[in-house]
């Protein structure tokens, strides 16, 4: 059997440091068997049989010119292998960060923090964190540790299935390459990582007849389970075309009426979403969707109870967001909570 | 014990080629390189080149790149060397040698080539 | 490409006698010198590799040394079948070369 341990990588490749010394390894022969070593490529004599080194090769500092193959052969001139020297350093603790888009599952991406150079894979496990009691020092099994399943084709992300909310994680990612292992933990709650996707089909459309009114729907993001209890509020933001600032208001619903919006012009309007309790952060902002009030005049409104005027429409100051209030239904279909100032109406 | 065979002569005509042959037997062929030399009278001895059997990676001198080619059989352990476009100045003693990567530790026979019209 | 030159061309001595043969390279080649016999109609034979050691079945009475530029086979005491032509190869650089020989005669 071969005297070289099989570093993690492929065969016949060996590995070494930088400024350090490399000792290179003679597979095909027994341990301790004195042999001869050649750059591949180069007939001279690297180290002899005499060296008394036996079945190893040493290079004091390596460096990049000492990158490549070698050839060992034996004393009678047979071929002990070849070997390839590859240099570069070991792992660094990784960069790891998590994120939840729901509060189920989440998922954890890393990166490496130094570039080794070398041929990297990177374990990935996750366990439970559990306040244990004073007398109790072992581990609960409910508690892990459990493989993190990483995405394939390589994807630097692993996913934790079927998460409680309300428990804490600690997630080890480990980078390992051939001259060893750095591991990162990192203690995580989901309700501190969560991030909703942000919302979905998002429509905006005219009012007929309201010429500073626009209505705003859009659906929960398909990545929110559907659940009752786990509700998400809304951010809605809109602006005229060419205008620079964003207005924002927090809607009570999956549905918003802005009311003083500018005759004629197009509107971008985006929506974000969070979870209702404020748990984690607001998701990113939907893609714009565009609408323009419609053009129509504005019709007298006849009350059962007397004769009104409908005030004309007035822009309200929407700087400031109104404070939030949670959807407190999944898919509500809710009025517009400014309908009655918008259409205050006057006796006659 | 290691031998080496190859023919003892070859008779060819020149602007034609030939596929000299040595066949190895008494140790494992695919553990040593095996190397071809030519030798005159006058201008002694040259390497040719070498081929690892197990992989077949070849080591050229310039001089004879567009000259020989070197190629092995495993499954007959059986070295060859082909020269091509022969000129007078091929006429020589052809030996194989298995060796270590720069070394000629066991030699065959020799073949003598004549490149003669 | 490395040449090798050796001198003395011919060498004349009788059975008994020490003898000395030398190599120069054409630059230095640290030890990655080596030595080869070649009797009439025979195939070389190694003697001695890497400019000093000695090969297998090798009689003692054969030594090399040297290093650098300047090598030198030596015979301790001449037997009759010593008498042939005498190469040194280097395996310094590509392509492997060889000295034109030495021929080592029966005075």
């Known amino acids: 059997s071969s005297p070289c341990p099989q570093a993690w990588g492929p065969p016949g490749v060996q590995y070494g440091q930088p400024g350090r010394s490399v000792k290179l390894c003679c597979p095909g022969v027994t341990a301790g068997d004195p042999v001869s070593w050649f750059r591949d490529g180069e007939p001279k004599l690297l180290q002899g049989p005499d060296s008394g080194l036996g079945h190893e090769l040493v290079l004091a500092q390596a460096d990049s010119t000492d990158e490549g193959t070698y050839i060992c052969q034996t004393l009678d001139g047979a071929l002990g292998g070849t070997v390839t020297l590859q240099l570069g350093y070991p792992p660094a603790r990784p960069v790891v960060s998590c994120q939840a888009a729901d509060y189920e599952n989440f998922s954890c991406t890393w990166s490496p923090s130094q570039i080794s150079g070398l041929p990297t894979r990177y374990l990935t496990s996750y366990r439970k964190k559990t306040v244990l009691g004073a007398d109790s020092q072992r581990r609960s099994p409910s508690t892990g540790p459990w493989p993190c399943p990483q995405d394939p084709l390589g994807a630097a992300r692993c996913v934790v299935h079927g998460a409680e909310f309300w428990s804490q994680y600690r997630i080890n990612v480990t980078e390992v390459n051939p001259l060893g292992a750095s591991t990162r933990l990192l203690d995580v709650s989901l309700q501190s990582i969560l991030r909703p996707d942000p919302p979905q089909g998002l429509r905006v459309e005219s009012v007929p007849g309201y010429p500073r009114r626009l209505r705003a729907s859009w659906t929960y993001p398909a990545s929110w389970p559907c659940q009752p209890h786990f509700l998400l509020k809304f951010r809605l933001q809109y602006r005229p075309a060419q205008h620079p600032a964003w207005s924002t208001v927090e809607p009570a619903g999956l549905e918003e009426v802005i009311t003083d919006a500018v005759a004629g012009l197009p509107h971008a309007v985006r929506v974000s979403a969070r979870d209702f309790l404020d748990a984690g952060t607001w998701s990113t902002w939907s893609p714009e969707a565009w609408g323009t009030p419609s053009t129509g005049t504005i019709p007298k409104e006849i009350p059962a109870w007397g004769q009104l005027h409908t005030q004309p429409e007035v822009e309200p100051q929407v700087d400031s967001p109104a404070p939030p209030r949670p959807s407190l239904q999944p898919h509500p279909r809710l009025l517009d909570h400014r309908d009655s100032v918008e259409q205050v109406a006057v006796l006659a | 014990q290691v031998q080496l065979q190859q023919p003892g002569a070859e008779l060819v005509r020149p602007g034609s080629s030939v596929k000299l042959s040595c066949k190895a037997s008494g140790y494992t062929f695919t553990n040593y390189w095996m190397h071809w030399l030519k030798q005159r009278p006058v201008q002694g001895l040259e390497w040719i080149g070498n081929i690892g059997p197990s992989d077949s990676k070849t080591h050229y001198n310039q001089k004879f790149k567009d000259k020989a080619t070197l190629t092995v059989d495993k499954s007959s352990s059986t070295a060859y060397m082909q020269l091509n476009s022969l000129t007078s100045e091929d006429s020589a003693v052809y030996y194989c040698?298995?060796?270590?990567?720069?070394?000629?530790?066991?030699w065959g026979q020799g073949t003598l080539v004549t490149v003669s019209a | 490409d490395i040449v090798l030159t050796q001198s003395p061309a011919t060498l004349s001595l009788s059975p008994g006698e020490r003898a000395t043969l030398s190599c120069r390279a054409s630059q230095s080649i640290s030890n990655n010198l080596h030595w080869y016999q070649q009797k009439s109609h025979e195939a070389p034979r190694l003697l001695i590799k890497?400019?000093?050691q000695s090969i297998s079945g090798i009689p003692a009475r054969f030594s090399g040394s040297g290093s650098g530029t300047d090598f030198t086979l030596s015979f301790s005491s001449l037997e009759t079948e010593d008498f042939a032509v005498y190469f040194c190869?280097?395996?310094?650089?590509?392509?492997?070369?060889f000295g034109q020989g030495t021929k080592l005669e029966i005075k």
């Open positions: 040698a298995r060796g270590d990567y720069v070394l000629f530790t066991y």
């Open positions: 190869q280097q395996s310094y650089s590509w392509p492997l070369t």
């Open positions: 890497y400019a000093s």
